[in-house]
């Protein structure tokens, strides 16, 4: 769905895409884990939150994230199908008033405290990938995805077809 030619063509246009309305389509809580079943966890350290990718001990409770789904116009000047081109974006909030943010300068994923309306850095285009895995593409930097690097979440540039389906940008959502 996000082939290289597609990614390059949308780099400029995606910045201009507008989110339809301010209220989400739907919201629900889910735990987030990697393709290899490591859990994404959040810990409060020195008044800021850290994000970890780790194996949980047996019976250890998984952290939940509030996923809020928004519908956005897919840039129609490129897609050629007018107003009908749409995409889903999500924001991810593990705790009240904190949202995952893309820090494109540092290629990092951070938790920031902020008020609504949320900045563009908090929005990720949702892709359904292998079976029931999803990927999260930065709204502010198309072709860049949330991924796993050295047991942390990081931003990973997907710049060749072979890298598109690498396991480190695939995540599982579980509501149980």
């Amino acid at each position: 769905a996000f082939g290289i030619s597609g990614v390059q063509k949308y780099t400029r246009a995606l910045h201009d895409s507008s989110i339809t309305g301010i209220s989400p389509i739907t919201e629900y809580l889910a735990s987030l884990s990697t393709y290899n079943d490591q859990s994404i966890t959040f810990a409060l350290e020195d008044e800021s939150y850290e994000i970890y990718v780790e194996d949980l001990k047996k019976d250890e409770k998984k952290d939940k994230v509030l996923l809020s789904y928004y519908e956005s116009q897919h840039p129609s000047n490129e897609s050629g199908d007018g107003v009908d081109g749409k995409m889903l974006m999500v924001t991810l909030s593990p705790t009240k008033d904190f949202w995952l943010h893309a820090n494109n300068k540092e290629h990092s994923v951070e938790l920031h405290k902020c008020e609504k309306p949320l900045p563009d850095q908090a929005f990720f285009v949702l892709h359904n990938m292998h079976s029931n895995c999803v990927s999260f593409e930065c709204k502010t930097d198309p072709g860049v995805f949330i991924g796993v690097k050295d047991n942390h979440l990081a931003l990973i540039k997907v710049d060749s077809s072979e890298n598109l389906c690498t396991e480190n940008i695939l995540f599982k959502l579980s509501e149980t």
């Epitope: 769905a1 050629g80 749409k86 949702l126």
Partner: antibody, heavy 122, light 107 residues
């Protein structure tokens, strides 16, 4: 406007294989997944699988994993499905369909090809 | 796999009637449900996505509602061109699955 043009109907012998095509126009082919759906005469709809033309990435319904092979040719904006070891159970109309949302199957299928009827008969 | 239980399997109504088709998902699919209309010999046509949003060009007499596991398609003031088979489809998880269909006929 978005269009999906499928190849013509096919009559094939049991045990043979067949390759159907779906040519897309009116949008950026590499940006939306193409799905394949089967409909037996007088029956309902069954999802076979989907392919991302930009990457060639594929997701199959387990029921069709040994039956169908999905491919694309981005230079001609065409998706293909190859059906192998055909039997009477495979006699059906096969549709290609483009997803509503960029990157996501949550919104269903907004655009459909006209369908290709495959008849398996000796 | 998520099973989609659609009812009734067939329905006979008079022109001008309001009819209701229901779809029940075997697990929570939130709002990720689509409805299609298929006329004999034709292709399926997307009517409603996201449980309640009308696709472009679909008349307002079609109405979708529900979330979670229970969904409804309502057609008010039935028209001759509405005679078709209607399918629900869940888009929550792979494999994507359809209801068995509801064949709508005129009395």
């Amino acid at each position: 406007q978005v269009q999906l043009q499928q190849s013509g109907n096919d009559l094939v012998k049991p045990g043979a294989s067949v390759k159907l095509s779906c040519k897309a126009s009116g949008y950026t082919f590499t940006s939306y997944w193409i799905n394949w759906i089967k409909q037996r005469p007088g029956q309902g709809l069954e999802w076979i699988g989907r392919i991302a033309p930009g990457s060639g990435f594929i997701s199959y319904n387990e029921l069709f994993k040994d039956k169908a092979t999905l491919t694309v040719d981005t230079s001609s904006s065409t998706a293909y499905i190859q059906l192998g070891s055909l039997s009477s159970e495979d006699s059906a109309v096969y549709f290609c369909a483009r997803e509503f949302y960029y990157g996501s199957f949550y919104g269903g299928f907004a655009y459909w090809g006209q369908g290709t009827l495959v008849t398996v008969s000796a | 796999d998520i099973q989609m239980n659609q009812s009734p399997s067939s329905l006979s109504a008079s022109l001008g009637d309001t009819i209701t088709i229901t779809c029940h998902a075997s697990q929570n699919i939130h709002v990720w449900l689509s409805w299609y209309q298929q006329k004999p010999g034709n292709i399926p046509k997307l009517l409603i996505y996201k449980a309640s949003t009308l696709h472009t060009g679909v008349p307002s007499r079609f109405n979708g509602s529900g979330s979670g596991t229970g969904f409804t398609l309502t057609i008010s003031s039935l028209q001759p061109e509405d005679i078709a088979t209607y399918y629900c489809q869940q888009g929550q998880s792979s494999p994507l699955t359809f209801g068995a269909g509801t064949k709508l006929e005129v009395k």
